[in-house]
Amino acid sequence: LSVQQGPNLLQVRQGSQATLVCQVDQATAWERLRVKWTKDGAILCQPYITNGSLSLGVCGPQGRLSWQAPSHLTLQLDPVSLNHSGAYVCWAAVEIPELEEAEGNITRLFVDPDDPTQNRNRIASFPG
């Protein structure tokens, strides 16, 4: 089982949309795949895929999950808020026929405030 996640870095404006993609590949067929998205180590959702369908379509605040055969799991955040900023990781495990798991690399999501003055103030507040 292998998991490739992208993009590595994503910068979007508050109120827009962010799309994180996880490609899950396995050399042999699987009957049930457990998937998980985490943000800063906390679980956003942990559905499974069987018969080509996700058991859950919601993933965290304003998060929508979709599965596109043969291998693409997409997390769409819409609309994006400032507290969506963080480090996202996709994890997958084949549960049936036999347990095998893998996880992607981190996607770092940066959300810029809709009001540019907020952005200037935030940057100005950094020490040094």
Partner: antibody
Amino acid sequence: QVQLQESGPGLVKPSQTLSLTCTVSGFSISTSGYYWSWIRQHPGKRLEWIGYINYGGGTSYNPSLKSRVTISRDTSKNQFSLKLSSVTAADTAVYCCATMADRFAFFDVWGQGTMVTVSS
Amino acid sequence: DIVMTQSPDSLAVSLGERATINCLSSQSLFSSNTNRNYLNWYLQKPGQSPKLLIYHASTRLSGVPDRFIGSGSGTDFTLTISSLQAEDVGDYYCQHHYETPLTFGDGTKLEIK
């Protein structure tokens, strides 16, 4: 590009252990998502998958041979090996190593094969 | 284990003519999770290792001539060579990767008539 080369004795006595090594060049056997297999071709041309070792060191064997087979690896030498115990004449075959990836699940690179004869 | 049954055992076809090889699996090789058939086709020329032609039942490997056509789904698969060339002679094998153990068909020997 990836190249695989089998090595080992061409003649093994019955009841002994067959030992072969596959040396991989141009690619690391620890690369995520890749599987390193042994396949044999019997004199009648029948192809038989023996088993694989994956990028993390996990193995999967053909149940018909599982009690006699061990596949291991040496990442420092970029090699993986086959041991088949208690051999009989039925184990006489051309033994090939081959690689396969999660993303493209087919044997895309093969060694040229080495003939192993089991005979006293 | 999934049993792969190939037919015919051997086949003689004239140059430029169509060659058809069949492969029947003992259980379905289609997954609704991935929308894929876990079936590959290989050609083995004398003195060489097998070389992949078709994967996922119908996808030609890059560089494989378009006269090689893979079709079928579930348990019934076909490899068609639309216009036989001299270099196409050899042994053809189907192979599944639906589950372990991976198994091959017994092969079809293709010759020129």
